[in-house]
């Protein structure tokens, strides 16, 4: 089953988010996917925890999964590269690094995105955008086209508080407003971007969608500057 | 749950045949590689065979010491794992543990073996 | 074929000690794709192996944190912080990352 889902956004613009990847397996989206170079895509570790023997592929230029578009392109990986220390049962550290086969023929709909150097929180109340091709309600209907949400950042002390996420957000994570609009896992590896520089990245883990005392969980990609440096070299 | 449950092991003389069969359930078996590893007694653990899923071609991969001997094989729409032993040696005598391969680690799944003792 | 060579045979501790287990491949085991496929199993008397670490350092789901792995190219080690009863048994390195896949001749962890 896919990973993630965007609950009470809309339809995105067509094409107008060049950065934003679906990560399939076997041919069906699985996780969102960030293109943060011209051979690597950024997504999420747990994304394919359960891919097993699948064939993992990265799909770019798109706006509909299903409908022939003349930006569309599916591209093989080369490799999978999940952080050192992400792990099975924690949402800590679940970054990953996809380089595609080949550069990515880049255009108006391909096209990577900036992202946050800079490790400083952001802060709370901005509004980020999310997008992905999770489902989009509770019955689990899946979109064909790209959808998208505006949140706001949520602080992390009230985040980590016992009746929300408990102290489990470290300062490698961040959080967004789950008040019905919301990102979930099958959005898991899509990008929030804040003022147009990737911010964060859809953590995989388990946790209801749409509640707002369970606010969205997102890695910080400035956290792990060095770590995406290292292996894009 | 997810279950692996090896049968078909037993006592066969030198030169003879045997297959081994693997029950999967609680996961999409059709997914997933598959492997045989083997422990004869008091010794260490021997990978002997990897098969691999429909999108990866079902290829397959085998030890050295079992090549053109030992075929492994599937059947997705019984979620089935088999190994086919021929020419047996005695050296083949082992527990054999049918085992499932994940995607970024390999053994996840282990079944609790079925016993293979070759002897005259 | 990639030989791996575990170190000690065996290793008497006393619980609560902590435990360094070492194992060495013939040659690099970097894949192809970029990734160290080493693994670390343990294998408890009378069961099946189970995997407590893979990639080199990567803890599987449910393994405690006392169990750590790390090292690079040809070199390898497994430590237990605080070794606990339920720790003893045999444990095998495995190299995932060229055919034929290959174990270690194990490591038993006894008390001392």
């Known amino acids: 089953p896919p990973r993630g889902r965007i609950l009470g956004g809309r339809e995105a613009e067509a094409h107008a988010r060049p950065y934003m990847a679906s990560v399939q397996l076997n041919g069906a989206h699985l996780c969102g996917g960030v293109l943060v170079a011209e051979q690597w895509v950024l997504s999420a570790a747990h994304c394919l925890e359960d891919a097993a023997d699948g064939k993992v592929q990265v799909l770019l230029g798109a706006h509909s999964l299903s409908q022939p578009e003349p930006s569309k392109r599916l591209y093989d990986v080369l490799r999978a590269v999940p952080h050192p220390d992400s792990q099975p049962d924690t949402i800590d550290h679940d970054l990953l690094l996809l380089q595609l086969s080949e550069k990515a023929t880049l255009g108006p709909a391909v096209r990577p995105l900036p992202w946050q150097r800079v490790d400083r929180d952001v802060a709370p109340g901005t509004l980020c955008d999310v997008a992905g091709w999770g489902i989009v309600n509770h019955a689990g209907r899946r979109p064909d086209s790209l959808q998208h949400v505006l949140l706001p950042v949520l602080d992390r002390a009230t985040c980590n508080r016992r009746t929300h996420h408990d102290g489990a957000i470290t300062e490698r994570l961040m959080c967004a407003e789950s008040n019905r609009r919301d990102s979930c896992k099958g959005d898991s590896g899509g990008p929030l971007v804040c003022g147009g520089v990737l911010e964060g990245v859809v953590t995989s883990g388990s946790r209801v969608c749409g509640n707002r005392k369970k606010p969205g969980i997102y890695t910080r990609v400035a956290s792990y500057a060095a770590w995406i440096d290292s292996v894009l070299a | 749950e997810v279950q692996l449950v090896e049968s078909g092991g037993g006592l066969v003389q030198p030169k003879g045949s045997l297959k081994l069969s693997c029950a999967a359930s609680?996961?999409?078996?059709?997914?997933?590689?598959m492997n045989w590893v083997r422990q004869a007694p008091g010794k260490g653990l021997e990978w002997v065979a990897r098969?691999?899923?429909?999108?990866?071609?079902?290829?397959?991969y085998y030890a050295d010491s079992v090549k053109d001997r030992f075929t492994i094989s599937r059947d997705d729409s019984e979620s089935m794992l088999y190994l086919q032993m021929n020419n047996l040696k005695t050296e083949d005598t082992a527990m054999y543990y049918c085992?499932?391969?994940?995607?970024?680690?390999?053994?996840?799944?282990w079944g609790t073996g079925t016993t293979v003792t070759v002897s005259s | 074929d990639v030989l791996m060579t575990q170190t000690p045979l065996s290793l008497p501790v006393s619980l609560g000690d902590q435990a360094s287990i070492s194992c060495r491949s013939s040659?690099?085991?970097?894949?192809?794709?970029?990734?160290?496929?080493l693994e670390w199993y343990l294998q408890k008397p009378g069961q099946s192996p189970k995997l407590l670490i893979y990639?080199?350092?990567n803890r599987f789901s449910g393994v405690p944190d006392r169990f750590s792995g790390s090292g690079s190219g040809t070199d390898f080690t497994l430590k237990i912080s605080r070794v606990e009863a339920e720790d003893l048994g045999v444990y095998y390195c495995?190299?995932?990352?060229?055919?034929?896949?290959?174990f270690g001749g194990g490591t038993k962890l006894e008390i001392k």
């Open positions: 085992v499932r391969h994940g995607y970024y680690w390999y053994f996840d799944v």
């Open positions: 609680g996961f999409s078996f059709n997914t997933y590689a």
């Open positions: 098969i691999r899923s429909k999108s990866n071609n079902y290829a397959t």
């Open positions: 040659q690099s085991i970097v894949h192809s794709d970029g990734n160290t496929y």
């Open positions: 990639r080199v350092s």
């Open positions: 495995f190299q995932g990352s060229h055919v034929p896949y290959t």
